[in-house]
């Protein structure tokens, strides 16, 4: 029986060039986290983080994906089109999958402010 | 054309070490994952482990750690794999292979270095 | 270490049959298996990832399915090139592992 639930950022806004911070969260659960897969909006993969093999980027992204904080990701170098959702798949053991959604806007404004809060979704 | 081209054939006495290297071309080397592979004659695959150019992070399979040491210079775009305190449970062909797109698999592989490890 | 179980070890059969491998891992990887083809005295190529996505510039009579545990690959009428060994390989965890191998030859 799957118990747990996925934390994540929510709904999150960022300046253009600058950088966020994409974090899930897994809790009330005391399954074994073996991969964390995050993809975009078009399914596309960004990242993966794997317990044992480390870390994979997707290499069209080496250069501007970082790895961290944590099982978390941090997206560099924003574009406009980087506007729009991600997810963050949990591979457990022995629960199964979990999945969490988190949408970036990414604004042009210099006034744009980084909010980032901890939502369930 | 996405290429690796790795270094000729080794004869070498047990005991001793020896170097082999893989150069790739026709992408970008800092942004793929380079694996290397064992295969013995006639038998199956065995993965070593694989060298991150863009940090030089490296991941190994346990059974080779203190046998084999990867490294890669991105100069060059060359990946390096050292083998050290050879038996003749070392001869085999060695192959070193790009990492896939989407995770730890094998898309572009090298024409493989044989090592034959006699006194 | 994740044991990859690949079957029949050998295989026979003509030009224009369907063949199918099977590859079956003893927990489970979701969908993170590869096949590769390797012919004699050559290097592997990818065929398939992620149990069933189809390598670039493969064609399109192989076709892998499956997850968890259970894995197939499937070749429609067979071509005189499609001969060789097909190995399957796990990518979710360390070590990764292959198959030992089934072996396609020419009835």
């Known amino acids: 029986m799957m118990t747990g639930t996925i934390e994540t950022t929510g709904n999150i806004s960022a300046k253009k060039g600058g950088s966020v911070i994409l974090q899930c969260h897994l809790s009330s659960t005391m399954a074994q986290v073996t991969q964390v897969n995050w993809e975009q909006h078009d399914h596309s993969l960004l990242a993966i983080r794997n317990a044992e093999l480390g870390w994979h980027i997707y290499p069209a992204f080496k250069d501007r994906v970082a790895p961290g904080p944590g099982l978390g990701l941090t997206l560099q170098s924003l574009t406009m089109n980087d506007t729009g959702e991600y997810f963050c798949t949990y591979h457990t053991y022995p629960d199964g999958t979990y999945r969490g959604r988190i949408f970036l806007e990414v604004l042009e404004s210099s006034v744009a402010e980084h909010s980032a809060r901890f939502q369930i979704p | 054309e996405v290429q690796l081209q790795q270094s000729g054939p080794e004869l070498v006495k047990p005991g001793a070490s020896m170097k082999m290297s893989c150069k790739a071309s026709?992408?970008?080397?800092?942004?793929?994952?380079m694996h290397w592979v064992k295969q013995k004659p006639g038998q199956g695959l065995e993965w070593i482990g694989y060298i991150d150019p863009y940090n030089d992070g490296s991941k190994y399979n346990e059974k080779f750690k203190g046998k084999a040491t990867l490294t890669s210079d991105k100069s060059s775009s060359i990946a390096y794999m050292e083998l050290s305190s050879l038996t003749s449970e070392d001869s085999a062909v060695f192959y070193c292979a790009r990492g896939g797109s989407r995770g730890w698999y094998f898309d572009v592989w090298g024409a493989g270095t044989t090592v034959t490890v006699s006194s | 270490d994740i044991q990859m179980t690949q079957s029949p070890a050998s295989l026979s059969a003509s030009v224009g049959e369907t063949v199918t491998f099977t590859c079956r891992t003893n927990?489970?990887?979701?969908?993170?298996l590869t096949w590769y083809q390797q012919k004699q005295g050559k290097s592997p190529q990818v065929l398939v990832y992620n149990a069933k996505t189809l390598a670039e510039g493969v064609p399109s009579r192989f076709s892998g399915s499956g997850s968890g545990t259970q894995f197939s690959l499937k070749i429609n009428s067979l071509q005189p090139e499609d001969f060789g060994s097909y190995f399957c390989q796990h990518h979710f965890g360390n070590p990764l592992t292959f198959g030992a191998g089934t072996k396609l030859e020419l009835k």
């Open positions: 026709g992408y970008k080397f800092t942004s793929y994952v």
């Open positions: 927990e489970n990887i979701y969908s993170y």
